[in-house]
């Protein structure tokens, strides 16, 4: 099959601090040395990029300095963490993996992880 399978959890609940973590695993058809991982958010039919990182196999993922994502890689598995989430960010987050080098190029798109974010209740004022 000339397609790359990407697996990710169906549902993840963000922590009270607005942090969500999930694993994105891909079945590599070839021996890639350069891999790009992108997190996409799908709302209705609109797809937007949340963050992206390119890494050399065996090295750490490096997201841009202002990225809300961090991650680590181990073999064909990427551990992704998205920070700063609020209730309005609840939605479907898709893991996209691209084997950039060497040829051939492969694209893998996961079915998405539904991330639920609940804003913490504000602390009530204390009277003492």
């Amino acid at each position: 099959c000339k397609a790359m399978h990407v697996a990710q959890p169906a549902v993840v609940l963000a922590s009270s601090r607005g942090i969500a973590s999930f694993v994105c695993e891909y079945a590599s058809p070839g021996k890639a040395t350069e891999v790009r991982v992108t997190v996409l958010r799908q709302a209705d039919s609109q797809v937007t990029e949340v963050c992206a990182a390119t890494y050399m196999m065996g090295n750490e993922l490096t997201f841009l300095d202002d990225s809300i994502c961090t991650g680590t890689s181990s073999g064909n598995q990427v551990n992704l963490t998205i920070q700063g989430l609020r209730a309005m960010d609840t939605g479907l987050y898709i893991c996209k993996v691209e084997l950039m080098y060497p040829p051939p190029y492969y694209l893998g798109i996961g079915n998405g992880t539904q991330i639920y974010v609940i804003d913490p209740e504000p602390c009530p004022d204390s009277d003492f």
């Epitope: 397609a3 790359m4 992108t38 937007t48 898709i94 996209k96 051939p104 492969y106 694209l107 798109i109």
Partner: antibody, heavy 118, light 108 residues
Framework: QVQLVESGGGVVQPGRSLRLSCAAS????????MHWVRQAPGKGLEWVAV????????YYADSVKGRFTISRDNSKNTLYLQMNSLRAEDTAVYYC???????????WGQGTMVTVSS | EIVLTQSPGTLSLSPGERATLSCGAS???????FAWYQQKPGQAPRLLIY???SRATGIPDRFSGSGSGTDFTLTISRLETEDFAVFYC?????????FGQGTKVEIK
């Protein structure tokens, strides 16, 4: 709005060179892979080349490998196709197309005609 | 290289009729990586369907896609006058990217 506009087509003799440009607007150019696709008169679509994101990764169809070079200038939001050693069979309308986040070619330019003839 | 074969080559139908276009792949293609395009004379192609079954932005719901593995189908439930055109299938899961040879849907 999101738009791609090609330019640089024309009539050229076999063996000569031509450079096509594709000006992008309305989206963050550097976040997308960009393709060239061509269509010979009365024929179907043929993928030509792709360049990814920062320009470090490029792929070519066998029919143009070694003769065509794809490049991009993200600071100018522009995609290029340098075509050398042109042949009669390269005669076609050349389209630039954006690879959407999910991979399909979601935005296309209007095309520019390249005619290779003596 | 994945070879895509479209059938029929030409489909002659009347407005209001249902159109069924087929595309067969020479080897299994993931359904996440399969698209359909429409091209009218003198115009650039337009993305209709991606991921085998998802409609692109602004595409009317009379267009639908289905299929998996090596067999994919584009269905136009009720042809409108503006639908008559050439339709191409494409796979984009690996290089090289390939298109089918096209199916022309013409007015009967």
């Amino acid at each position: 709005q999101v738009q791609l506009v090609e330019s640089g087509g024309g009539v050229v003799q076999p063996g000569r060179s031509l450079r096509l440009s594709c000006a992008a607007s309305g989206f963050t150019f550097s976040r997308y892979g960009m393709h060239w696709v061509r269509q010979a008169p009365g024929k179907g679509l043929e993928w030509v080349a792709v360049i990814w994101y920062d320009g470090s990764n490029k792929y070519y169809a066998d029919s143009v490998k070694g003769r065509f070079t794809i490049s991009r200038d993200n600071s100018k939001n522009t995609l290029y196709l340098q075509m050398n050693s042109l042949r009669a069979e390269d005669t076609a309308v050349y389209y630039c197309a954006r690879a959407g986040h999910l991979g399909a070619f979601d935005i296309w330019g209007q095309g520019t005609m390249v005619t290779v003839s003596s | 290289e994945i070879v895509l074969t479209q059938s029929p080559g030409t489909l002659s139908l009347s407005p209001g009729e249902r159109a069924t276009l087929s595309c067969g792949a020479s080897q299994s293609v993931g359904s996440n990586y399969f698209a359909w395009y429409q091209q009218k004379p003198g115009q650039a192609p337009r993305l209709l369907i991606y991921g085998a079954s998802s409609r692109a932005t602004g595409i009317p719901d009379r267009f639908s896609g289905s299929g998996s593995g090596t067999d994919f189908t584009l269905t136009i439930s009720r042809l409108e006058t503006e639908d008559f055109a050439v339709f191409y299938c494409q796979h984009y899961g690996s290089s090289p990217w390939t298109f089918g040879q096209g199916t022309k849907v013409e007015i009967k």
